[in-house]
Every structure is written in C-alpha cells, then in structure tokens.
C-alpha cells in the first residue's frame, strides 16, 4: 500500500504492497475458481469415463450452457468492452443454476464444489461493480431455474454424470475466455 506522507516507509511496511486493483482482484478470483474446477473435473474423470466419452452431444442437447460467440465482443477480433462485460456477467448468472446442480454431485470434493459456487457469486459482485453503468444485464427467472434444476436432477445416473462433466468443461471454457477478455479491459 502507499507510504503515508511524513512517515518513513519502513514504519509503514517493509516492503510495502499496493492494494489490488479491481482488475487484479477479478483476475485472482477467476484463477481461484478455475483451480476449483480442475479439482472437481479430476474427481469426475476418476469416477467415470465421461472425460473420454464421445457421446457428449447426446447430453449437450438437453443443456443450454452459456458460450462465448463472436457477437459477444469478447474475442480479439471485434472486441467491445461493454458488450463483453455484459456477456460475462449474464453468462455467470446463467451458470449459477448449473453450479447449484453440482452441489450434491461430489463426495471427496464437496467443499470445492461449494467454494466454486460461492466464489462465482463473489465474482459476479466484483464484475457488477466494474459494470455499474451497464443496464443491459438480465437475471434468469427463479422459476425457470427451479424447473431446470428439477429436470436435471431427474435424469438417470449416466446423464447426470455426463451433465456434471459438461457443466465443468463449459464453465472452464467460459471462464478462460472471460479471463482473456478481462485482461484487455
């Protein structure tokens, strides 16, 4: 942190650090969630063969997982800061229901699943602060989310395992794209 006027720096700190900028804080937070996803994917891949499965398309049809597209303005070509920020926040809000679904899907990584969910809420908050002048952010309907959750939980075991795998993979890709885009902002 900065040195106080009239104080010798060694009285304040040795050495002294700068408070994190909001961008650094967001960056660290995304890394934290990505590390959590890695741990969850490890458990998923260890307990089933979903990670090598070629039948992903079957399950993917049932899911409407957020994805980055060219029109979202998050890629290097056609980059648009405001449009991209809206897409990142909207996407994270849409992922929340899927993260809720993951909560009972892990045994040894239960804490990590909870941490990923909680940290995503924190990340949304950090980003909303960065985007406080943007009003184009739509929040998913709670009733829609509730019925989607019920539908996902009613699937057979194979589909639930596949859904878990796809959520983690898609969320990882979405966060990686977000991280790259946010570093340009």
């Amino acid at each position: 942190a900065p040195v106080l006027p009239g104080e010798d720096s060694k009285d304040v700190a040795a050495p002294h650090s700068q408070p994190l900028t909001s961008s650094e804080r967001i960056d660290k937070h995304i890394r934290y969630i990505l590390d959590g996803i890695s741990a969850l994917r490890k458990e998923t891949c260890n307990r089933s063969n979903m990670c090598e499965s070629s039948k992903e398309a079957l399950a993917e049809n049932n899911l409407n997982l957020p994805k980055m597209a060219e029109k979202d303005g998050c890629f290097q070509s056609g980059f648009n800061e405001d449009t991209c920020l809206v897409k990142i926040i909207t996407g994270l809000l849409e992922f929340e229901v899927y993260l809720e679904y993951l909560q009972n899907r892990f045994e040894s990584s239960e804490e990590q699943a909870r941490a990923v969910q909680m940290s995503t809420k924190v990340l949304i908050q950090f980003l909303q602060k960065k985007a406080k002048n943007l009003d184009a952010i739509t929040t998913p309907e709670p009733t829609t989310n509730a019925s989607l959750l019920t539908k996902l939980q009613a699937q057979n075991q194979w589909l639930q395992d596949m859904t878990t795998h796809l959520i983690l993979r898609s969320f990882k890709e979405f966060l990686q794209s977000s991280l790259r885009a946010l570093r340009q902002m």
């Epitope: 942190a1 900065p2 040195v3 106080l4 304040v12 700190a13 050495p15 002294h16 650090s17 408070p19 994190l20 804080r25 660290k28 937070h29 890394r31 934290y32 969630i33 590390d35 959590g36 890695s38 741990a39 990590q112 941490a115 924190v122 602060k129």
Partner: antibody, heavy 115, light 107 residues
Framework: YPQLVESGGGLVQPGGSLRLSCEAS???????MSWVRQAPGKGLEWVGS????????YYNTKFIDRFTISRDNSKNTLYLQMNSLRAEDTAVYYC?????????WGQGTLVTVSS | AIYMHQEPSSLSASVGDRVTITCQAS??????LAWYQQKPGKAPKLLIY???DRYPEVPSRFSGSGSHEDYTLTISSLQPEDFATYYC?????????FGQGTKLEIK
C-alpha cells in the same frame, strides 16, 4: 474437509522457535495468503502476506526480524516460521486468503509461549 | 501505521434493535475497509468489503457505509445469531490494521 487447516501450534519456551503450517486446498495455489494472529481476549493483528509464487512477502514491521512466511505450492502449504518467541506472541494464528480483505480463513492454531 | 479507532468497545442490545458500530481511521482510506464478525472460538467471517459491499450470503440486515476516514457498520434489526464481536480492517496501507473490536452482547 475445510479449505484451510493450520497446524504446528503448541507450547514453546521463551526464546524458542516454531513453524506453523497451513494446508490449503488446490484452490489457493494462485492466491495471495496472509497470516493473522489474535492474542487471548484481544483483537486481530496482521502478521504478513505472501504472493502466489512466494517471490514477494510483506510483513508487519513488528515481526519482520523474527517471523518468516513461505509457501510450498507442490504441497499446497503455507508456512510461518517464528523465532525468538516471547510471551506476548501467545495467540491463535490464522491463515487466510488475502484479497486485501480476508475472505477465507482457517480455524486457527494456538501458540503458547511460556516457561 | 494506520490507527483504526473503533467505537463502542462493547454494546448491549436486544433482538430487533438497530445497531451502529463506527470505525475512524487516522488517515484517508478511499473506502478500502472491511468488516468482520467473530464468534468465540471461531475464525472471523467477512461481512462487508470496500466500505459498503456486502459479501455474498451475508444477510441484508448488515450494511456498511462511509468515506474518507469514517466508516459505519449497521445491523438494521438484530437477530439472536448476531451477538458476536465485530472488527473493521483497513487495507489501503500496509501493514493492514484492525479496529480493537466491538463486543455486541444481549441486553
């Protein structure tokens, strides 16, 4: 299991040394981490922090000569090496994720310095 | 180092009361201030960061406000689980420093 678990506390004689450990889940690999202590019945006191790679360390000047923070990312563990301990170092020592504010804490480990 | 003067040091209140705890810094903080709740034998829990941002899943009865050197934590309607010790912390300057704490007790 909890995300941050401190260990290594105990009874030590004045002038002695102790190394505290904080075992972290994999989520903390790329995070700044801090040590914070709390003497019995007293308030919180920041000891210092370390960046993800262990290259940069920041200390409360009060502890800079006696305490050293380090980490071993291959073991997902944060350390606090405490030397020349005094009775006033008796406290619960917490490790925490440091985003400038501390949003994740361990349960703490008690260090008692007494003869 | 920045000195954080927290008041009151202890406070007796009843369930349903509105409670205010203040923290005054010895220097301008740019809202880089957090509030924590701590219960006996437990680690502190983050309530508020950046002066007025409520950490996710913290009940809406907790709110933070303030600017420059003066900051406030308000609990709008005390619940039984809110009886604890509260600390402010500045992170504008290293070393990070905490207030002395406010022990909130049942009247």
């Amino acid at each position: 299991y909890p995300q941050l678990v401190e260990s290594g506390g105990g009874l030590v004689q004045p002038g002695g040394s102790l190394r505290l450990s904080c075992e972290a889940s994999v989520l903390f690999k790329h995070q700044d981490m801090s040590w914070v202590r709390q003497a019995p019945g007293k308030g919180l006191e920041w000891v210092g922090s370390i960046d993800p790679r262990g290259d940069h360390k920041y200390y409360n000047t009060k502890f800079i000569d006696r305490f050293t923070i380090s980490r071993d990312n291959s073991k997902n563990t944060l350390y606090l090496q405490m030397n020349s301990l005094r009775a006033e170092d008796t406290a619960v020592y917490y490790c925490a994720r440091d985003l400038d504010f501390m949003d994740e804490w361990g349960q703490g480990t008690l260090v008692t310095v007494s003869s | 180092a920045i000195y954080m003067h927290q008041e009151p040091s202890s406070l007796s209140a009843s369930v349903g009361d509105r409670v205010t705890i203040t923290c005054q810094a010895s220097y301008w903080l740019n809202s880089e201030l957090a509030w924590y709740q701590q219960k006996p034998g437990k680690a502190p829990k983050l309530l508020i960061y950046d002066g007025d941002d409520r950490y996710p899943e913290v009940p809406s009865r907790f709110s933070g406000s303030g600017s420059h050197e003066d900051y406030t934590l308000t609990i709008s309607s005390l619940q039984p689980e809110d009886f604890a010790t509260y600390y402010c912390q500045q992170y504008r300057y290293t070393p990070y420093t905490f207030g002395q704490g406010t022990k909130l007790e049942i009247k």
